[in-house]
Amino acid sequence: QVQVVTQDEREQLYTPASLKCSLQNAQEALIVTWQKKKAVSPENMVTFSENHGVVIQPAYKDKINITQLGLQNSTITFWNITLEDEGCYMCLFNTFGFGKISGTACLTVYVQPIVSLHYKFSEDHLNITCSATARPAPMVFWKVPRSGIENSTVTLSHPNGTTSVTSILHIKDPKNQVGKEVICQVLHLGTVTDFKQTVNKG
């Protein structure tokens, strides 16, 4: 049967993002409608037809436009994505002969990790703290010269949709660590980034 080809997209917060739908059909549609999927019922965003051109709903006036004006291939672009834009979007091709044929493309918003790495001596031990804030939640690992060093991790979700993961490395004999390199590894969206810290006796 006739189908619609879509592709999910993952884009960085406060950057543009585009979602595309392609009708796999010999003929163009009569009208294309883009809707945001909502819990109760989908919300109309924009339509494109030969009769009326592009019609953007008021709530989306300054947020989106149709950047590929086609009745077989249609692309909407968000000028500056926010966390509220994350979700799934339906493109509906109203075709002659086959009715409304829909596809779904999902948009995921990410925030690159902001990482801080510092250490603190206190009496007979050393705490090295690595904190990473990102969306989706990052993971924090340690690479240390020797094994058996304990660490504790705390995860905190923020109202802005980001998550902070803070890991503290507890070193009981700090003298052995002076001059040596400790690496905090942050894993985010399949990419591992190393953050290096050399411990100096303050």
Epitope: V2, N25, A26, Q27, N51, F96, G97, F98, G99
Partner: antibody
Framework: QVQLVQSGAEVKKPGASVKVSCKAS????????ILWVRQAPGQRLEWMGH????????NYNLKFKGRVTITRDTSASTAYMELNSLRSEDTAVYYC??????????WGQGTLVTVSS | DIQMTQSPSSLSASVGDRVTITCKAS??????LSWFQQKPGKAPKSLIY???RLVDGVPSRFSGSGSGTDFTLTISSLQPEDFATYYC?????????FGQGTKLEIK
């Protein structure tokens, strides 16, 4: 020039099947939907269904309860409409037509199917 | 199914007359309506699509209007070759359905 040429008149007995062909020429067969419409004597036109020759996707009027099948042979640029379990009320002229979206421009000459015992 | 009701069912008019045929849908069909002309023993001929768009080669004396549920076909000045039966077709919702036809006869 564009032509849709339908097969000749048929006389069938109740319960039999009929297969009407519609041969297209003068254009790219897969670029246009082929639709089938019938008209019983003195009656209004009736949409039976249609096919997108590009993918072979078809859509039918449920009134025919699965009795109608529309197919195509792209190598022969021909569409077919088969109607099974014929009854007297299926006596009609059957037309094929082509459309680009909702733009109908060429029709076949019509095929009279008579169902009689 | 969406019901399409044409009026009048038949109409007598003279060459040069302005004629209007209406088609009413049982529910909103947007602008998804076509008009056809059919002469006895012949295949239908497309006149108008999407309520108001003229098919290539159709004389400009034919025009269509309307949206939603009420549609009109107008022939501005009847010519001898216009005497025929006219049908409307809705294609907003499947199954697509025709009106019962309006027979235009010579007065």
């Amino acid at each position: 020039q564009v032509q849709l040429v339908q097969s000749g008149a048929e006389v069938k007995k109740p319960g039999a099947s009929v297969k009407v062909s519609c041969k297209a020429s003068g254009y790219s067969f897969t670029d246009y939907i082929i639709l089938w419409v019938r008209q019983a004597p003195g009656q209004r036109l009736e949409w039976m269904g249609h096919i997108d020759p590009y993918y072979g996707s078809s859509n039918y009027n449920l009134k025919f309860k699965g009795r109608v099948t529309i197919t195509r042979d792209t190598s022969a640029s021909t569409a077919y409409m088969e109607l099974n379990s014929l009854r007297s009320e299926d006596t009609a002229v059957y037309y094929c037509a082509r459309s680009k979206r909702d733009y109908f421009d060429y029709w076949g000459q019509g095929t009279l199917v008579t169902v009689s015992s | 199914d969406i019901q399409m009701t044409q009026s009048p069912s038949s109409l007598s008019a003279s060459v040069g007359d302005r004629v209007t045929i209406t088609c009413k849908a049982s529910q909103d069909i947007n602008s998804y309506l076509s008009w056809f002309q059919q002469k006895p023993g012949k295949a239908p001929k497309s006149l108008i699509y999407r309520a108001n768009r003229l098919v290539d080669g159709v004389p400009s004396r034919f025009s269509g209007s309307g949206s939603g549920t009420d549609f009109t076909l107008t022939i501005s000045s009847l010519q001898p070759e216009d005497f025929a039966t006219y049908y409307c077709l809705q294609y907003d919702e499947f199954p697509y359905t025709f009106g019962q036809g309006t027979k235009l006869e010579i007065k």
